[in-house]
């Protein structure tokens, strides 16, 4: 039977009543056009809700916007937008959000064309007053807080000026010309690449990367011929063009760019591209793209210098630069990461890893599912995710794979199963063990989004025609209650709900139609007089993630340790509530050589966990350039996996040795990087 | 720019039909509903049909009504007039215009030049 | 269905003079919902009023709408050259949409 159906399935008792109750219409007096829907803090159950309806007509645009506010998660909005002075807001810039708590909201205006510069309304009481700045230049770019202080704000202008404010956009300094991207880095420092010949495209390759850790006052340059630059984690990547040829090298720093080392990654020719897919403060997923047109590259992990990779995966599917990856962080288990890879005979499919890259395999095929046409063999075949590029090929495929950090193992994707990934209408599969095994959870495309920590998941059909049901679980999944929330069918647009999976209230969006003229509308349903009590612990149960064999010791170790976690039980209807936080227990394991990685000029053969030379590096010194001198490397092939914490076991030699020798990567050396001061 | 772009008109013999198409462009589509005005030559203006952003909703004056279907294609920008059992009193220029759209400060609607539809043995 | 009513069916009169146009509905139309519209040989008709009185994006204020109910004025206060064309009303509140039967302002 399908999934929810079974006799087994028990029904929440009431419920239409308590989610009727709950449920709470709101009618926006607006044009339909596009709405934009934006958090601000966290708990605080402030929404802004921008609606934008613009039309570019030949001489002048003409459109409007409006804001509204509500403080009650949705439930209720009122109309902010005479706090804005009824100003047409542009949407491209979005509503610049501050970080954390602060209360923060940049919205920007649009001016008409002969003005001096641009304007925004600022706020820092959670949009409940708004104050208008006009702006000393036009900006290019949303405004971009400093992660450590909420009033420090950046932004670069249309003549390619970098604006700086210290006082929350009261007061802005342009504090350098010519610059073509500009990113906060740690303690307030800002980088940036400049062009000196006459514009970012022009100057691709020659480019500066330039320093300033005391906002403007003074600037230091820290890589010239840089083609690009990106931050991850606590490295700092530049590729940077080669002397001779047109290709760029990968340059990482872990000092904030005072010194440099070339990455051991190949380097790219002029149409290819490098692309960091996650970064955290132990390593990196750095892709590397292939030489021609072909829509894929290779994907390579560092080690915890950023330094030294190790191939993770061949025939990576990524299109073109800025184009579709469907590389995904699993973030409700530690060590997952799912991607696509594209087959010789050009068909793509699903790759997942438990370790973090250190190997992937196929995803395990659903036990309530049957191979579909792809397959060769009806009997033997695995289940392949639709992700981000499945979305850009336009296949009925309404949302990406969704997991939270709090709803710990829980992965929710749209899927198909056989050989490779299927054109045919998708289906919606769930893991509750982070991605080790599947079940079919809902037939046919859905939108879905969890809810108190995965106490419950809520899911709507992808229709063309309106729609007035939601479809919720309290078990993860395995069943499903149906309620009807208007009797007045509506053309969904999207589900919306805090950000963070701990709100009980989701907000199902889309537009009425009456006559000729339709209206956005809201409807938010709180489901805590579902879960009507709160959790105890009688309601959870011990789970060992990443098990795989409880018969063995080891059974559950990934990175060097292994964690237990307290799980809301399946059958347990309660209250995770705002304040959950995952309970984990973990445990240190011996070393074996899983827990390293090959070393540069290693590799591992398939299937093999022992690393074995490259044939083209055999009986050659090992050295590569390390802080602009030359190291030589003495290895038996293995290095630790970054972030792995085991103790004991297997342990092979590692030793590098400086040569004292000086190197250089056609960067500049520490001695020749120059500082001044404004 | 934004613009409508009327084609498919032509000489018909009565009782034959025509689809008339209109492309959009410069303008989110799908949020317009949209009308078919006609106008016989040396006549006033005549609304024919109108359909809804979505498409949901469609609307025809009783003299075309079970004769012209109207539809639209969001993913392609454009509108269509399907029109059977063609009259010689269908003889006009037929328009494409978006319905009227109000805001807080303002108003518009935009036309296409329009397509002469001849019926005539 | 609505019906409009304009008149006169003709208005000849000399630039620089006032346009009182009228038009009359069978039953009474939301005030929101009346437009009067512009239209010179050969062009697609130009929108000037919505909401029986309001301008349009670009139009002179030498055109104002009032009225409501069943019975709404376009004037035009002091007639430019240009201005010669016929002119339509439309309520556009419900279905079916309905023009009035239109008034030539000629030169006289």
């Known amino acids: 039977s399908a999934p929810g159906e079974d006799e087994e399935c028990g029904r929440v008792r009431d419920f239409v009543a308590k989610l009727a109750n709950n449920t709470h219409q709101h009618v926006f007096d607006d044009l339909r056009g596009s709405v934009s829907l934006s958090w601000v803090g966290d708990s605080t159950g402030v929404i802004l809700v921008l609606t934008t309806f613009h039309v570019p007509l030949v001489i002048m645009t003409f459109g409007q916007s409006k804001l509204y506010r509500s403080e009650d998660y949705g439930k209720n909005f009122k109309d902010i937008t005479d706090l804005i002075n009824n100003t047409f807001i542009r949407t491209e810039f979005g509503m610049a959000i501050g970080p954390e708590n602060s209360g923060k909201v940049v919205l920007t205006a649009e001016v008409s064309g002969g003005s001096r510069g641009g304007r925004i309304f600022r706020s820092s009481d959670f949009a409940k007053n708004f104050v208008q700045t006009d702006l000393p230049f036009h900006p290019l770019t949303q405004m971009m807080y400093s992660p450590q202080n909420s009033d420090y704000l950046l932004a670069l202008s249309t003549e390619n000026g970098l604006w700086v404010s210290k006082n929350f956009g009261g007061k802005w300094e342009e504090i350098h010309k010519a610059v073509c991207l500009a990113k906060w880095g740690s303690d307030n420092t800002i980088f940036f690449t400049t062009y000196a010949n006459g514009s970012c495209k022009a100057d691709l390759g020659a480019l500066e990367l330039w320093r300033t850790s005391d906002l403007g006052k003074s600037f230091k340059t820290i890589g010239v011929k840089i083609y690009s630059f990106g931050l991850g984690g606590r490295f700092l990547f530049a590729s940077v063009m080669a002397d001779k040829d047109t290709t760029r090298r990968i340059h990482v720093s872990t000092d904030q760019g005072d010194t440099w080392s070339m990455a051991q990654l190949p380097s790219v020719g002029q149409e290819q591209f490098y692309s960091i897919l996650a970064a955290n403060d132990d390593m990196v997923f750095m892709h590397v793209d292939e030489p021609g047109d072909t829509g894929f590259g290779t994907i390579f992990t560092s080690d915890d210098r950023g330094i030294v990779y190790s191939k993770s995966l061949d025939r990576h599917l990524y299109t073109t630069t800025g184009g579709e990856t469907d590389f995904t962080n699993v973030t409700s288990l530690r060590g997952v990461y799912i991607t696509s890879v594209l087959s010789e005979d050009n068909s793509i499919q699903t790759m997942i890893t438990f370790d973090q890259g250190g190997r992937w395999t196929h995803l395990r095929k659903p036990e309530n599912s049957e191979c579909d046409a792809t397959a060769k063999n009806k009997n033997e075949c695995s289940l392949h995710i639709h992700a981000s590029y499945s979305i850009s090929q336009k296949l009925n495929v309404p949302m990406a794979p969704l997991s939270e950090p709090n709803a710990v193992g829980i992965v929710i994707a749209h899927g198909s199963v056989g050989d490779a990934i299927s054109v045919m209408v998708p289906d919606v599969y769930i893991s509750d063990d982070g991605g080790y095994s599947w079940t079919k959870m809902l037939e046919g495309p859905h939108y879905y989004t969890i809810l108190d920590s995965g106490g419950i998941i809520v899911a709507i059909e992808h229709s063309s025609r309106p729609i007035n049901v939601i479809k919720f679980s309290t078990d993860e999944g395995q069943c499903w209650q149906t309620y009807t929330f208007t009797r007045d069918p509506i053309y969904f647009t999207g589900l919306a709900s805090e950000p963070g999976a701990r709100s009980m209230n989701i907000s199902i969006w889309g537009f009425t139609e009456s006559f000729l003229t339709s209206q956005w509308v809201s409807y938010t349903i709180d489901f805590k007089d579902i879960l009507e009590r709160n959790c105890e612990e009688k309601d959870y149960t011990i789970w060992l993630a990443h098990s795989t064999d409880p018969e063995d010791y080891e059974d559950g170790c990934i990175l060097g340790y292994k964690e237990q976690f307290l799980r809301l039980r399946k059958s347990s209807v309660c209250q995770n509530g705002r304040d959950y936080v995952v309970t984990k227990q973990p445990s240190i394991c011996l070393c074996s050589l899983e827990d390293f990685l090959c070393d540069f000029g290693y590799y591992r053969p398939e299937n093999d966990s022992k690393c074995v030379e490259q044939p083209e590096l055999k009986g050659h010194d090992l050295e590569f350039c390390l802080y602009g001198r030359e190291e030589h490397l003495t290895t038996n092939g293995y290095r630790k996996i970054p972030g792995d914490k085991c103790q004991g076991g297997v342990n092979p030699v590692r030793e590098v040795k400086d040569l004292k020798k000086k190197c250089t990567s056609n960067f500049l050396s520490p001695e020749k990087q120059n500082s001044k001061s404004n | 720019e934004v613009q409508l772009l009327e084609s498919g008109g032509g000489l018909v013999q009565p009782g034959g039909s025509l689809r008339l198409s209109c492309a959009a462009s410069?303008?989110?589509?799908?949020?317009?509903?949209m009308s078919w005005v006609r106008q016989a030559p040396g006549k006033g203006l005549e609304w024919v049909s109108a359909?809804?952003?979505?498409?949901?909703?469609?609307y025809y004056a009783d003299s075309v009504k079970g004769r012209f279907t109207i539809s639209r294609d969001n993913s392609k920008n454009t509108l269509y007039l399907q029109m059977n059992s063609l009259r010689a009193e269908d003889t006009a220029v037929y328009y494409c215009?978006?319905?009227?759209?109000?805001?807080?400060?303002?108003?518009?609607?935009?036309w296409g030049q329009g397509t002469m539809v001849t019926v005539s043995s | 269905e609505i019906v409009l009513t304009q008149s006169p069916g003709t208005l000849s009169l000399s630039p620089g003079e006032r346009a009182t146009l009228s038009c009359r509905a069978s039953?009474?139309?939301?005030?929101?919902?009346l437009a009067w519209y512009q239209q010179k040989p050969g062009q697609a008709p130009r929108l000037l009023i919505y909401?029986?009185?309001s301008r349009a994006t670009g139009i002179p204020d030498r055109f104002s709408g009032s009225g409501s109910g069943t019975d709404f004025t376009l004037t035009i206060s002091r007639l430019e050259p240009e201005d010669f064309a016929v002119y339509y009303c439309?309520?556009?509140?419900?279905?079916?949409?309905?023009f009035g039967g239109g008034t030539k302002v000629e030169i006289k």
């Open positions: 439309q309520q556009y509140g419900s279905s079916p949409l309905t």
């Open positions: 215009a978006t319905y009227i759209v109000a805001t807080i400060a303002d108003a518009f609607d935009i």
């Open positions: 039953q009474s139309v939301s005030s929101s919902y």
């Open positions: 359909i809804s952003g979505s498409g949901g909703g469609t």
């Open positions: 909401g029986a009185s």
């Open positions: 410069g303008f989110t589509f799908s949020t317009f509903a």
